[in-house]
Interface confidence: low
């Protein structure tokens, strides 16, 4: 029988009492047309929604926005729209909110066709007042708020302008024209790229890189001959286009793009493309394209400077630059990512890595499923996870998977279990443990969130006919109850609740449909009576994450240490609440070959802990680039790996020699680079 | 308009293998899939399996599993559906189908399987010593 | 794999009058079903999908109705042209299915 319909599963005393009492309808006087919807800080409980309604007319479109606000999780919403003096608001813009609990809300107006600039409209007390501000400029982006202080903004315009506030959008200057991209870095330093000649498209591969650390007063030109550039963890890096030919190559700085080195990855052509999976203050994933229109390319994994690369997985699926890839960090547990490998007979298959890329296996296959039809073997298959490429492929997956950093181990997929990726319905899958091990949770597609740090997982069925049905499960997902929230069935839109799953509360968004009209409407139900008491110590059971073997010694050793943690027990119905911190306790592992990556030139076979040296650089000296300089590596094949934490055991020897030779690197080096003032 | 052109019958002998082409037009063709039926005589419909022009993968029928091969080629948008190790058994009328397999689109009334929409001629194999 | 059973084997139906066919899945195949038309020499054609959506051009006497396991095709008044062979498919799980077809002659 499916999860949650067997005898085992017990019921929730007196469920629907306790939440028809807490389910909260709001019919929004809206036409449907589209609604966005933001949470304001973080256990504020204020939400925005902005709903947009476009009336097409023969020769313009007339637009119409209305804004709602609610400050007790969106069980009530009160229009605001007349704080914005009924303007009509860009929705490609969204709605800008600040860092952290700053706030701060920046709304952009739809302005006539005439006018000089754009119009914004500014709150910095949750949304409770608004200030319009006349732009000088019109914005082609959403205002961009620094991460180090939300008074800071910058944005660019139409007119490929750099524009900086340091009041909170009251006043503007424009910095720096012919800008293509612009990012906060860290200490509200700003990086962008700025063309010459022609335009950003014209110039790619001949735009400098510039740097502002004093929001514009002064400016140090930290590259040339660049193509993009990106911001990951601590690392700076650029691609830059090589002296002779087409092809472009990646540099990195950890120190603001005062300095770089060449990173060793395969340099790339016009048609291919590189891209930062995932980057934190130890590594960097990168994506290399393979040359031609594969589909695929190399995840390469870096050591902690970003400069020395090891590969990490091949036929990694990337359809095309900014497209799709079903690259997922499972941020439930350390040192887990998930991807799809594109194999040799063109299917589709999922790879999981539990020691942050060191080596990559498929997903078990779940206990009370079966193999489909792209099994050959019906016994030995896998479970493959539909992301991304799936949602942009438009199979019937409504969502992508969910981990939560405060829901320890668990993720919620969509999946197929045979030999890849299968095109037929998929059903949801859960794993309590980080990804080791998988369990059916429920049958054909599913909308899905985790309420209160995983003690409450809810879902919706993803059905083209109204619904009227929630389902919920106390125990991760192993037993499911289904509530009717409403008499009248509604055509479902989405799932809302606030980021963290901390809260209690979720959303139901649709709209109603009669003959002549279609309004947007929301349920918000809170499940605080369905935990009706707080968990107590008893309520937790220790659990050793990443464990495979419990008579091992180094059991649960991942990255150089283990973590134990405090898990809820699937029996307990209690709440872990808005202040539930995860409790864990970390201790550090004996090293191992498990510890290492391969070094440069070096290549861990397959289903080998061994490191051997690739042969086609057998008995040449190992030479890279760094600081401009070259170095000669003196190696026996291993460097430990970024964030791990092992102490004694195995130590490989691993010495890096200064060989006072200038690098073939057409980038600029420090001693080249110019500082300039406004 | 959209229609799929398949290629002309074929008579094999017993063990030889089968190559049927599907070339479509009059829409995006890597916006579908497309399935591949057979209709033996005088018999219903089998389906054999199905390709996603996008990254050319497939799912078979276990029943064609290691005889059936499908590919597709994006420059000419045409599929192909290869059946080797052919036996008496396998005299039929072939079929492409554009087959939506699975597309969710938005909106009321069309997130459900939208059924293979488009088919092309058939084209008869026959298989006989 | 899922298996489609549909009955009558054979409906003798007179025009104008209504013709109902069953079609039942092994296992729930939800809303995932399409039911097709063929015709002698000719490929299938494609009536209805999401188990009760008429596909474009198809005329409103053809109309489905079911969800889960038990699902009927319904031909309000017959018409001449109406006269053939008739199939359900699933897609829910692969391999997708067929129903073993239900030939509807004149009575």
């Known amino acids: 029988s499916a999860p949650g319909e067997d005898e085992e599963c017990g019921r929730v005393r007196d469920f629907v009492a306790k939440l028809a009492n807490n389910t909260h309808q709001h019919v929004f006087d809206d036409l449907r047309g589209s609604v966005s919807l933001s949470w304001v800080g973080d256990s504020t409980g204020v939400i925005l929604v902005l709903t947009t309604f476009h009336v097409p007319l023969v020769i313009m479109t007339f637009g119409q926005s209305k804004l709602y606000r609610s400050e007790d999780y969106g069980k009530n919403f009160k229009d605001i729209t007349d704080l914005i003096n009924n303007t009509f608001i860009r929705t490609e813009f969204g709605m800008a909110i600040g860092p952290e609990n700053s706030g701060k809300v920046v709304l952009t107006a739809e302005v006539s066709g005439g006018s000089r600039g754009g119009r914004i409209f500014r709150s910095s007390d949750f949304a409770k007042n608004f200030v319009q501000t006349d732009l000088p400029f019109h914005p082609l982006t959403q205002m961009m708020y620094s991460p180090q202080n939300s008074d800071y903004l910058l944005a660019l315009s139409t007119e490929n302008g750099l524009w900086v506030s340091k009041n909170f959008g009251g006043k503007w200057e424009e910095i720096h024209k012919a800008v293509c991209l612009a990012k906060w870095g860290s200490d509200n330093t700003i990086f962008f790229t700025t063309y010459a000649n022609g335009s950003c498209k014209a110039d790619l591969g001949a735009l400098e890189l510039w740097r502002t650390s004093d929001l514009g007063k002064s400016f140090k030109t930290i590259g040339v001959k660049i193509y993009s550039f990106g911001l990951g963890g601590r690392f700076l890096f650029a691609s830059v286009m090589a002296d002779k030919d087409t092809t472009r190559r990646i540099h990195v700085s950890t120190d603001q793009g005062d300095t770089w080195s060449m990173a060793q990855l395969p340099s790339v052509g016009q048609e291919q493309f590189y891209s930062i999976l995932a980057a934190n203050d130890d590594m960097v994933f990168m994506h290399v394209d393979e040359p031609g229109d594969t589909g695929f390319g190399t995840i390469f994994t870096s050591d902690d400077r970003g400069i020395v690369y090891s590969k990490s997985l091949d036929r990694h699926l990337y359809t095309t630059t900014g497209g799709e890839t079903d690259f997922t960090n499972v941020t439930s547990l350390r040192g887990v990512y998930i991807t799809s490998v594109l194999s040799e007979d063109n299917s589709i298959q999922t790879m999981i890595t539990f020691d942050q890329g060191g080596r990559w296996t498929h997903l078990r296959k779940p206990e009370n499923s079966e193999c489909d039809a792209t099994a050959k073997n019906k016994n030995e298959c896998s479970l493959h996870i539909h992301a991304s490429y799936s949602i942009s492929q438009k199979l019937n997956v409504p969502m992508a998977p969910l981990s939560e950093p405060n829901a320890v181990g668990i993720v919620i997929a969509h999946g197929s279990v045979g030999d890849a990726i299968s095109v037929m319905v998929p059903d949801v899958y859960i794993s309590d443990d980080g990804g080791y091990s998988w369990t059916k949770m429920l049958e054909g597609p599913h909308y899905y969130t985790i309420l209160d740090s995983g003690g409450i997982i809810v879902a919706i069925e993803h059905s083209s006919r109204p619904i009227n049905v929630i389902k919920f499960s106390t125990d991760e997902g192993q037993c499911w109850q289904t509530y009717t929230f409403t008499r009248d069935p509604i055509y479902f839109t989405g799932l809302a609740s606030e980021p963290g799953a901390r809260s209690m509360n979720i959303s139901i968004w649709g709209f109603t449909e009669s003959f002549l009209t279609s309004q947007w409407v929301s349920y918000t139900i809170d499940f605080k009576d369905i935990l009706e008491r707080n968990c107590e110590e008893k309520d937790y059971t220790i659990w050793l994450a990443h464990s495979t073997d419990p008579e091992d010694y180094e059991d649960g050793c991942i990255l150089g240490y283990k973590e134990q943690f405090l898990r809820l027990r699937k029996s307990s119905v209690c709440q872990n609440g808005r202040d539930y911190v995860v409790t864990k306790q970390p201790s550090i592992c004996l090293c191992s070959l498990e510890d290492f990556l391969c070094d440069f030139g070096y290549y861990r076979p397959e289903n080998d802990s061994k490191c051997v040296e690739q042969p086609e650089l057998k008995g040449h000296d190992l030479e890279f680039c760094l600081y401009g300089r070259e170095e000669h590596l003196t190696t026996n094949g291993y460097r430990k790996i970024p964030g791990d934490k092992c102490q004694g055991g195995v130590n490989p020897v691993r010495e890096v020699k200064d060989l006072k030779k200038k690098c073939t690197s057409n980038f600029l080096s420090p001693e080249k680079q110019n500082s300039k003032s406004n | 308009q959209v229609q799929l052109v398949q290629s002309g019958a074929e008579v094999k002998k017993p063990g030889a293998s089968v190559k049927v082409s599907c070339k479509a037009s009059?829409?995006?063709?890597?916006?579908?899939?497309m399935s591949w039926v057979r209709q033996a005589p005088g018999q219903g419909l089998e389906w054999m399996g199905i390709?996603?022009?996008?990254?050319?993968?497939?799912s078979y029928a276990q029943k064609f599993q290691g005889r059936v091969t499908m590919t597709r080629d994006t420059s000419t948008s045409t599929v192909y559906m290869e059946l080797s190790s052919l036996r008496s058994e396998d005299t039929a009328v072939y079929y492409c189908?554009?087959?939506?397999?699975?597309?969710?689109?938005?909106?009321?009334?069309?997130?459900?399987?939208?059924?293979?929409?488009?088919w092309g001629q058939g084209t008869t194999v026959t298989v006989s010593s | 794999e899922i298996v489609m059973t549909q009955s009558p084997a054979t409906l003798s139906v007179s025009p104008g009058e209504r013709a109902t066919l069953s079609c039942r899945a092994s296992q729930s195949v939800s809303s995932n079903l399409a039911w097709y038309q063929q015709k002698p020499g000719q490929a299938p054609r494609l009536l209805i999908y999401?188990?009760?959506t008429r596909a474009t051009g198809i005329p409103a006497r053809f109309s489905g109705s079911g969800s889960g396991t038990e699902f009927t095709l319904t031909i309000s008044s017959l018409q001449s042209e109406d006269f053939a062979v008739y199939y359900c498919?699933?897609?829910?799980?692969?391999?997708?299915?067929f129903g073993g077809g239900t030939k509807v002659e004149i009575k």
């Open positions: 189908a554009r087959d939506p397999s699975g597309i969710a689109l938005a909106g009321p009334g069309s997130r459900y399987y939208r059924g293979m929409d488009v």
């Open positions: 009059g829409y995006t063709f890597t916006s579908r899939y």
């Open positions: 498919q699933q897609a829910r799980l692969g391999p997708w299915t």
């Open positions: 390709i996603n022009p996008v990254g050319g993968s497939t």
């Open positions: 999401g188990a009760s």
